[in-house]
């Protein structure tokens, strides 16, 4: 008796975070024996879509010509071979930006910071929101969440960084969101360039924050230190 069919691979091009109105293609890659591919969306009762495999039959394309709120969500795909259906793929979370107006990102006391000192990035929205995300360009794990507890709405979130090292330098943006759908984000804030200048004794990252030789600093999640700035906000890293 053969074991279960291997699960397919699911991904999105050009990526899984898509601006409103832009196109995105979801790909599901299975095996050469696939007869049919099925894409399921969380909380969608029927198979969300189904397609014939593209030659040589090992993958299928699911096109979204114009991104809207309805397409944002969590997807899985399957393929059917002559012996039955595969295991589900790992989930793909398709996020839409542009659902709300853009927040403002600023640095306190300044975006020019000396290594070893402290800086706080402040993300402010015009309307109250319950989730704020800080992303750093070219980081493999760019999302840092600050999510309010008990649905409390906030106009801003603070992301303290202390002590600052050269690793913290770079371009940041922030987003705001409502908790009822973390797949819907605001327009991105304008970029903020955080410039870290050296000190007489440039402190190295402490062992607890050191990066492995297998990955450079840009591959690490942002891990700012410090107490939670608002009593209503809880920190989440992804």
């Amino acid at each position: 008796q053969a074991g279960p069919l291997p699960k397919p691979t699911l991904w999105a091009e050009p990526g899984s975070v898509i601006s409103w109105g832009n196109s995105v293609t979801i790909w599901c890659q299975g095996t050469l024996e696939a007869r049919e591919y099925r894409l399921d969306k969380e909380e969608s009762p029927a198979p969300w879509d189904r397609q014939n495999p593209l030659e040589p039959k090992n993958k299928a394309r699911f096109s979204i010509p114009s991104m809207t709120e309805d397409y944002a969500g969590r997807y899985r795909c399957y393929y059917r071979s002559p012996v039955g259906w595969s295991q589900p793929s790992d989930p793909l979370e398709l996020v839409m930006t542009g659902a709300y107006s853009k927040p403002t990102l600023s640095a306190l006391p300044s975006p020019l910071v000396t290594s070893g000192k402290s800086v706080t990035l402040l993300c402010q929205s015009r309307s109250p929101m319950d989730t704020f995300l800080l992303i750093k360009e070219r980081a493999a794990h760019p999302l840092l969440h600050l999510r309010s507890e008990h649905g409390a709405q906030q106009h801003q979130a603070e992301f303290p960084m202390s002590p600052v090292t050269s690793v913290h330098g770079g371009t940041y943006r922030c987003f705001s969101s409502h908790g009822f759908s973390h797949y819907l984000l605001s327009h991105p804030s304008d970029p903020l360039e955080l410039i870290v200048s050296g000190s007489l004794e440039d402190p190295r990252p402490s062992p607890t924050r050191s990066v492995s030789t297998a990955a450079g600093p840009e591959d690490q999640p942002l891990m700012p230190t410090g107490s939670v700035p608002h009593s209503g906000l809880r920190r989440h890293w992804e």
Partner: antibody, heavy 120, light 107 residues
Framework: QVQLVQSGAEVKKPGASVKVSCKAS????????MHWVRQAPGQGLEWMGE????????NYNEKFKSRVTLTVDKSTSTVYMELSSLRSEDTAVYYC?????????????WGQGTTVTVSS | DIQMTQSPSSLSASVGDRVTITCRAS??????LNWYQQKPGKAPKLLIY???RLHSGVPSRFSGSGSGTEYTLTISSLQPDDFATYYC?????????FGQGTRLEIK
């Protein structure tokens, strides 16, 4: 019980368009894809396309892709099939049929059919 | 597209006869084969799905079998209500395609 009720017969001129409706009841409308199949007089069955009522996703037979449009109105549990640039060969009975998405990809319940006559 | 060919195109039989209709696919359809019955002026009705599974309410005198590219519908003992046209349909790939039909007439 599952019921698919289609709109009445239509007579159209060549070059015109026709829009046929199919109202579903007796089951959760958004949980099943819907097919459209046609049958010319004295001929066999020909699959035109399918639509997912929960999100409007469609798959079409290439033969009809440029002329057929399937749409859905969730508020009334109704799917529509519009066929444009009609010609005499489009004279047929048009059926909607519910998909039973499991092994077989069969069509388990059918509408009563809508006769479309294309004549100058 | 997958071509579906039924044989015979028409068939005369008597009440109580055992009847077999064959459907051949142009490629392997992995048992995704369904059978329908249609009477004049009426919509088709699903009889059998996935080669051999009886749709709800269908009498047990109807049965299906086959694999790969060859499939059969068998009516073990014809009843007066069974005289109709029968269609096979593949659900293996898009577009869905039907056989041309087999007309079953009273002898």
């Amino acid at each position: 019980q599952v019921q698919l009720v289609q709109s009445g017969a239509e007579v159209k001129k060549p070059g015109a368009s026709v829009k046929v409706s199919c109202k579903a009841s007796g089951y959760t409308f958004t949980s099943y894809w819907m097919h459209w199949v046609r049958q010319a007089p004295g001929q066999g069955l020909e699959w035109m396309g399918e639509i997912n009522p929960s999100n409007g996703r469609t798959n079409y037979n290439e033969k009809f892709k440029s002329r057929v449009t399937l749409t859905v109105d969730k508020s009334t549990s109704t799917v529509y099939m519009e066929l444009s640039s009609l010609r005499s060969e489009d004279t047929a009975v048009y059926y909607c049929a519910r998909d039973r998405y499991d092994e077989g990809n069969a069509m388990d319940y059918w509408g009563q059919g809508t006769t479309v006559t294309v004549s100058s | 597209d997958i071509q579906m060919t039924q044989s015979p195109s028409s068939l005369s039989a008597s009440v109580g006869d055992r009847v077999t209709i064959t459907c051949r696919a142009s490629q392997d359809i992995t048992n995704y084969l369904n059978w329908y019955q249609q009477k004049p002026g009426k919509a088709p009705k699903l009889l059998i799905y996935y080669t051999s599974r009886l749709h709800s309410g269908v009498p047990s005198r109807f049965s299906g079998s086959g694999s790969g590219t060859e499939y059969t519908l068998t009516i073990s003992s014809l009843q007066p209500d069974d005289f109709a046209t029968y269609y096979c349909q593949q659900g293996d790939t898009l577009p869905r395609t039907f056989g041309q039909g087999t007309r079953l007439e009273i002898k």
